[in-house]
């Protein structure tokens, strides 16, 4: 038979766990029940991040950076867990943890890999500069550096320029893309790996329509089945372009059903919106309606962006009176 | 009655390996962390690292990374160390020593003496 | 690495005396320490456990007392059997570290 090989020089049991910046996490660690437990956690094997024994905390060489955010399992320390608590983590608490368990006939050491990442919800926007297009992906915070691709009418794009900004614990990161004159279907994924997250931000040209003053114009925003879930948190914002801005005519947010309306002669079906068809009508067109107008679907998940152009004309009537 | 049985004194050359063992009777082996301590001749005593029979992690001392090994052997309760590319400065009594964080029960020691 | 001082090498006493032998931890060891005793070509024995509990068998004429980093084995009465090498070790955690080591001598 051969021995049961533990090598002195090999690391010790050890775990990854993935935390969420500002979220609470668990590092585990087991023992074999005994009595005279002591747990000490340690970061980088020098800071002490929480001690117990005697039957309590002792905190008194606690590092403050981890001062009221640890505790253990109290009640479960005589069951064999030596777990520990770990609210809020921060970027600066990645890193490898030790957890020393001593009972009076037992003595353990697992370590603990936290790593941590960030993924504040992307967002697609759709920009004018000058005569320039653009779709412009972006993050506000992120880490560790996401992977983002682009695809036109489903086929990967090789040009991908990143404006990336770090600060003190994470990246910002802007991914732009001249579209003008294009009238393809543009998606834009941002993948955080260690998270396992991904999001991504679809825009769709509709063809232009062209209407008569006093008309009425229905506009279509239906989201593509491949990203859409409604059980999930959504808002549909209805948006017109005017002077290279955007003004919100309407949103509609899933949560509550609520829908606001800032334009008076804009109406939105409720039947549809129940069937997640988010088209709307706007009536009584005059000529300052021509413009771009943008229906964005977003979640935590994706953006979908619809933008339709619409031109009023003059009616024969008010041209005759010209 | 608890007892800790070590091999013999060994004499070795510089540079060889040895293997000490260390067979328990009287408690449940897989219970306790069985732990290795080095006395060198006329000094203090110094832990070496401990194992876990049952395959949870066990503690070490840095110090002897790449010159002790620990092992176990569940079937007959006995535990090993092997140290490697030996110098004079090995030359100690080895003790094992059963227990927690602190050691209850010790091997009567086992004599190294490294020498050409 | 905690350094456990034990400052006297050798104390000469006499039968019948109280002996105190005393141990300094480098930081706080939180109680976490434990006296040996070992007798020439002899392992070590445990005596006490986190500062003062006697381990099973030891005669109640050795106490341990202290707490932060000072720590004192007492012999009430010294026995001829007690003449020995006193170590303290510090268990609070890992690497375990012990005392150079006490040794009684009768004077």
């Known amino acids: 038979i051969f021995p049961l090989a533990f090598f002195i020089y090999v690391p010790m049991n050890e775990q990854i766990v993935i935390g969420r910046l500002d979220e609470d996490i668990i590092l585990p660690s087991s023992f074999e029940r005994g009595s005279e437990v002591v747990i000490h956690w340690k970061y980088q094997d020098s800071y002490k991040v929480h001690s117990y024994y005697k039957g309590s905390d002792h905190l008194e060489s606690q590092d403050p950076r981890y001062a009221n955010r640890t505790s253990l399992f109290y009640n479960e320390i005589q069951n064999g867990n030596a777990s520990l608590f770990f609210r809020r983590v921060s970027l600066l608490d990645e890193g490898i943890y030790t957890c020393y368990v001593g009972t009076a006939i037992q003595v353990i050491t697992n370590k603990v890999v936290l790593k941590v990442g960030v993924f504040l919800t992307p967002v697609m926007k759709y920009e004018k500069r000058n005569t320039n297009s653009f779709l412009i992906c972006s993050v506000l915070s992120v880490y560790p550096r996401p992977i983002i691709t682009w695809k036109m009418d489903n086929t990967p794009i090789s040009e991908n320029n990143m404006e990336e900004t770090g600060s003190l614990d994470s990246f910002s990161i802007n991914s732009p893309l001249n579209i003008t004159g294009s009238n393809s279907s543009y998606e834009c994924t941002i993948e955080n790996s260690l998270l396992k997250q991904t999001w991504t931000g679809r825009w769709t040209m509709k063809d232009g329509l062209h209407k008569m003053q006093s008309e009425h114009v229905s506009l279509s925003c239906q989201p593509v089945n491949d990203y859409f879930s409604p059980n999930q948190d959504f808002k549909v914002t209805w948006s017109r372009m005017k002077s290279g801005t955007f003004s919100v005519l309407a949103y509609y947010l899933s949560s509550s059903q609520n829908t606001i309306i800032n334009e008076s002669r804009f109406s939105w079906n409720k039947e549809l919106i129940n069937q997640s068809d988010f088209s709307m009508n706007l009536m009584d067109l005059n000529l300052s309606d021509s413009g771009e107008y943008l229906c964005n679907i977003s979640s935590d998940e994706y953006t979908l962006l619809t933008i339709h152009t619409v031109h009023v004309e003059p009616s024969q009537e008010t041209a005759s009176h010209n | 009655e608890v007892q800790l049985q070590q091999s013999g004194p060994e004499l070795v050359k510089p540079g060889a390996s040895v293997k000490i063992s260390c067979k328990t009777s009287?408690?449940?082996?897989?219970?306790?962390?069985m732990h290795w301590v080095k006395q060198s001749h006329g000094k203090s005593l110094e832990w070496i690292g401990g194992?876990?029979?049952?395959?949870?992690?066990?503690p070490y001392n840095q110090k002897f990374k790449g010159k002790a090994t620990l092992t176990v052997d569940k079937s007959s309760n006995t535990a090993y160390m092997e140290l490697r590319s030996l110098t004079s400065e090995d030359s100690a009594i080895y003790y094992c020593?059963?227990?927690?964080?602190?050691?209850?029960?010790w091997g009567q020691g086992t004599t190294l003496t490294v020498s050409s | 690495d905690i350094v456990m001082t034990q400052s006297h090498k050798f104390m000469s006493t006499s039968f019948g005396d109280r002996v105190s032998i005393t141990c300094k931890a480098s930081?706080?060891?939180?109680?976490?320490v434990a006296w040996y005793q070992q007798k020439l070509g002899q392992s070590p024995k445990l005596l006490i456990s986190?500062?003062?509990t006697r381990h099973t068998g030891v005669p109640d004429r050795f106490t341990g007392s202290g707490s932060g980093t000072d720590y004192t084995l007492t012999i009430s009465s010294l026995q001829a059997e007690d003449l020995a090498l006193y170590y303290c070790q510090q268990h609070y955690d890992t690497p375990f570290t012990f005392g150079s080591g006490t040794k009684l001598e009768i004077k």
């Open positions: 194992i876990n029979p049952n395959n949870y992690g066990a």
């Open positions: 020593a059963s227990g927690g964080y602190y050691f209850d029960y």
């Open positions: 930081q706080d060891v939180g109680t976490a």
């Open positions: 009287g408690y449940t082996f897989t219970e306790y962390t």
């Open positions: 986190w500062a003062f």
